[in-house]
Amino acid sequence: LVPHLGDREKRDSVCPQGKYIHPQNNSICCTKCHKGTYLYNDCPGPGQDTDCRECESGSFTASENHLRHCLSCSKCRKEMGQVEISSCTVDRDTVCGCRKNQYRHYWSENLFQCFNCSLCLNGTVHLSCQEKQNTVCTCHAGFFLRENECVSCSNCKKSLECTKLCLPQIENVKGTEDSGTT
């Protein structure tokens, strides 16, 4: 099956790589604009230059193109704890990330929030914190894992999900008491 091509892709595929078909004259192939620039005017004829202009401050194009306008630079979302890793340039969008010892949780494909990496207090680090994944902790005896933090089994009440995790310790305590009374 031939993949469905949009009008722009169909037009571009008629011309060699790095060129696009003139919107008013499909016999002319114009050279695309370099990254960091945008299309101001189509080439007037075959072999003639396309009029490309550099993107203005606050905008960019990251690849060769024939866009009539540059793309607006992204802004890092402070309310999501994001920080700017690198500023926007004419040929590269802003790069946003999290602070040291934080990881990203993606709410959607392009929107992430920064959260602090777990320190594994009362436990050991099983897997270190990564860009998109919190630390994985293994808890010491007498502690259970709750939202990736090690919490004392003394905080575990009956009928909660921690009972299974704390059961071995409870049994050990009972066993010690039982052996002491015989």
Partner: nanobody
Framework: EVQLLESGGGLVQPGGSLRLSCAAS????????MGWVRQAPGKGLEWVTA????????FYADSVKGRFTISRDNSKNTLYLQMNSLRAEDAAVYYC?????????????RGQGTLVTVSS
């Protein structure tokens, strides 16, 4: 066994309001981030809003900011979603969900959902 039971959906006119509730059981509700996920007809799941266990931290999708408010009552193991100024594009099945932090977008454990229809 984790159970999440949504209620409060229905038919509302554009500009109207609805309040959704989610009764949670089978886990320690106050320990977890909880939220609302929606799925419009023919579209994928999307996070609408979420709230931390203590209620001190929240997330809202840009499309609902200023119109929707998430809240929780840990003493009642209940999550709420107040939806105001409803629009046609808000029509969807709304699911209560347990948030699994890290990576994503993932949609955690969800309830059966409640249908919200916005139509005049």
């Amino acid at each position: 066994e984790v159970q999440l039971l949504e209620s409060g959906g229905g038919l509302v006119q554009p500009g109207g309001s609805l309040r959704l509730s989610c009764a949670a059981s089978g886990f320690t509700f106050e320990w977890y981030w909880m939220g609302w996920v929606r799925q419009a007809p023919g579209k994928g799941l999307e996070w609408v809003t979420a709230i931390s266990g203590s209620g001190g931290s929240t997330f809202y999708a840009d499309s609902v900011k200023g119109r929707f408010t998430i809240s929780r009552d840990n003493s009642k193991n209940t999550l709420y979603l107040q939806m105001n100024s409803l629009r046609a594009e808000d029509a969807a099945v709304y699911y209560c969900a347990k948030v699994k932090l890290g990576g994503g977008p993932n949609f955690g454990y969800r309830g059966q959902g409640t249908l919200v229809t916005v139509s005049s």
